[in-house]
């Protein structure tokens, strides 16, 4: 890929909210399983960030499978628009403040903070580096601002709007959203390298989601998973380009894949996302 091939997708000054999942399994691909039944089910699509229909075979599969659209939405989506501004006097916290701390499925452990609803305090935990949920903050201060009760009777909401409990007026603050791993690519890019079950030693590449790079590994020739590419370029094309690089000042998103654009509506703004 040369620099000229790059496409620039312009978004508004407001940053695209990162994809933050309430449950790790919401990132799994739709899996129809090995059986042959034809059952209408729903799964959460991480590319469109919506619950969609798929045909389930009736056995096995994975947890990203729901009987109804409502159940899928309940488990895997959150209504951003309803959370941006809170105007009620009771100053309720964002719903994610009540989620259990979730290290996610990766193992690149880093220090993060979560709001402990039992102790009513923000506390430290170890985050694996990908997925998890929104009760996950880079700093203790950020966690306190968003989830703890403020000292003067106000609650700072998660998009930086401070609510004054006396007159219920809104005071804008610096916009800061909990900054998790921003995953916009295929779910298998998050899986670890898997040699498989045979005895060959083939040179392959896998995407290391913790460091954000494609790395070589030895493939046994059978089994394994889909995080397995014959060249570094193929690996980068499939996985690296699926991770949208967030640039806070310029409001630019660079993506290198030249594919047909698909318009996706995300909460309060429209952006262009590439088809994978």
């Amino acid at each position: 890929d040369s620099e000229e091939d790059e496409e620039h997708t312009i978004i508004t000054d407001t940053e695209l909210p990162p994809l933050k999942l309430m449950h790790s399994f919401c990132a799994f691909k739709a899996d129809d399983g090995p059986c042959k039944a034809i059952m209408k089910r729903f799964f959460f699509n991480i590319f469109t960030r919506q619950c969609e229909e798929f045909i389930y075979g009736g056995c096995e599969g994975n947890q990203n499978r729901f009987e109804s659209l409502e159940e899928c939405k309940k488990m895997c989506t959150r209504d951003n628009a309803n959370r941006i501004i809170k105007t009620t006097l009771q100053q309720e916290k964002p719903d994610f403040c009540f989620l259990e701390e979730d290290p996610g499925i990766c193992r690149g452990y880093i220090t993060r903070y979560f709001y402990n609803n039992q102790t009513k305090q923000c506390e430290r935990f170890k985050y694996g580096g990908c997925l998890g949920n929104m009760n996950n903050f880079e700093t203790l201060e950020e966690c306190k601002n968003i989830c703890e009760d403020g000292p003067n009777g106000f609650q700072v909401d998660n998009y930086g709007t401070q609510l004054n409990a006396v007159n219920n007026s809104l005071t804008p603050q610096s916009t800061k959203v909990p900054s998790l791993f921003e995953f916009h690519g295929p779910s298998w890019c998050l899986t670890p390298a898997d040699r498989g079950l045979c005895r060959a030693n083939e040179n392959r590449f896998y995407y290391n989601s913790v460091i954000g790079k494609c790395r070589p590994f030895k493939y046994s020739g059978c089994g394994g998973n889909e995080n397995n590419f014959t060249s570094k370029q193929e690996c980068l094309r499939a996985c690296k380009k699926g991770f949208i690089q967030r640039i806070s000042k310029g409001g630019l998103i660079k993506t290198k894949r030249k594919r047909k654009k698909q318009r996706v509506k995300i909460a309060y703004e429209e952006i262009f996302v590439k088809n994978m």
Epitope: E100, P103, T111, Y113, N116, Q118, Q121, E123, R124, F125
Partner: antibody
Framework: EVQLVESGGGLVKSGGSLRLSCAAS????????MSWVRQAPGKGLEWVGT????????YYADSVQGRFTISRDNAKNSLYLQMNSLRAEDTAVYYC???????????WGQGTLVTVSS | DVVMTQTPLSLPVTLGQPASISCKSS???????????LNWLQQRPGQSPKRLIY???KLDSGVPDRFTGSGSGTDFTLKISRVEAEDVGVYYC?????????FGQGTKVEIK
């Protein structure tokens, strides 16, 4: 007063299984992540694993990953360690410990001895 | 994994005299949040471990002030200003900055 009392240790053959329990009292159990740490005879301490406050997520040391499972029952103020495919090198005193708000172990139980014979 | 190295492994001391234990880590224990998660445990003979010091220098409640912790980065020290009979036991440093948590080999403090 914070109290952690382990039980369930004993002698088991290599390849066998054992389930340890830790009864907690003197604090709001569900508010704290909990850990297991072990100490082989005459040796130092080794972290085994940790479970989150609600019990939905766990962390494990590489040496026990896939063989040991940590769980908890917040209604019973109890922490568990299910140990499968036991090896001689798993012989140790197993301690449960509470994780404080800094994600550091602050209180420890008295331990329970697990002996794996080959 | 982070390797924690304690010296000395055995420390015979005279009652009323000071004692010092060194703990070195194979990489810095300064975390991204600006805190250093280095801790000290005391294990008296036949007893379970008890936390003495956390975050390098903070004493747990009920710990006598003759114990002090210091250090930064990779080098840390536990000092006992005047050793008493009840201080006999094994002292462990351990780090909670990086996963997995790792412990030093322990320093056995005994009375001469």
């Amino acid at each position: 007063e914070v109290q952690l009392v382990e039980s369930g240790g004993g002698l088991v053959k290599s390849g066998g299984s054992l389930r340890l329990s830790c009864a907690a009292s003197g604090f709001t159990f569900s508010s704290y992540a909990m850990s297991w740490v072990r100490q082989a005879p005459g040796k130092g301490l080794e972290w085994v694993g940790t479970i989150t406050t609600g019990g939905s997520y766990t962390y494990y040391a590489d040496s026990v990953q896939g063989r040991f499972t940590i769980s908890r029952d917040n209604a019973k103020n109890s922490l568990y360690l299910q140990m499968n495919s036991l090896r001689a090198e798993d012989t140790a005193v197993y301690y449960c410990a509470r994780q404080d708000g800094n994600f550091l172990m602050d209180y420890w139980g008295q331990g329970t001895l697990v002996t794996v014979s080959s | 994994d982070v390797v924690m190295t304690q010296t000395p492994l055995s420390l015979p001391v005279t009652l009323g005299q000071p004692a010092s234990i060194s703990c070195k880590s194979s990489q810095s224990l300064l975390d991204t949040d600006g805190k250093t998660y280095l801790n000290w445990l005391q294990q008296r003979p036949g007893q379970s471990p008890k936390r003495l010091i956390y975050l390098v220098s903070k004493l747990d409640s009920g710990v006598p002030d003759r114990f002090t912790g210091s250090g930064s980065g990779t080098d840390f020290t536990l000092k006992i200003s005047r050793v008493e009979a009840e201080d006999v036991g094994v002292y462990y440093c351990w780090q909670g900055t990086h996963f997995p948590f790792t412990f030093g080999q322990g320093t056995k403090v005994e009375i001469k």
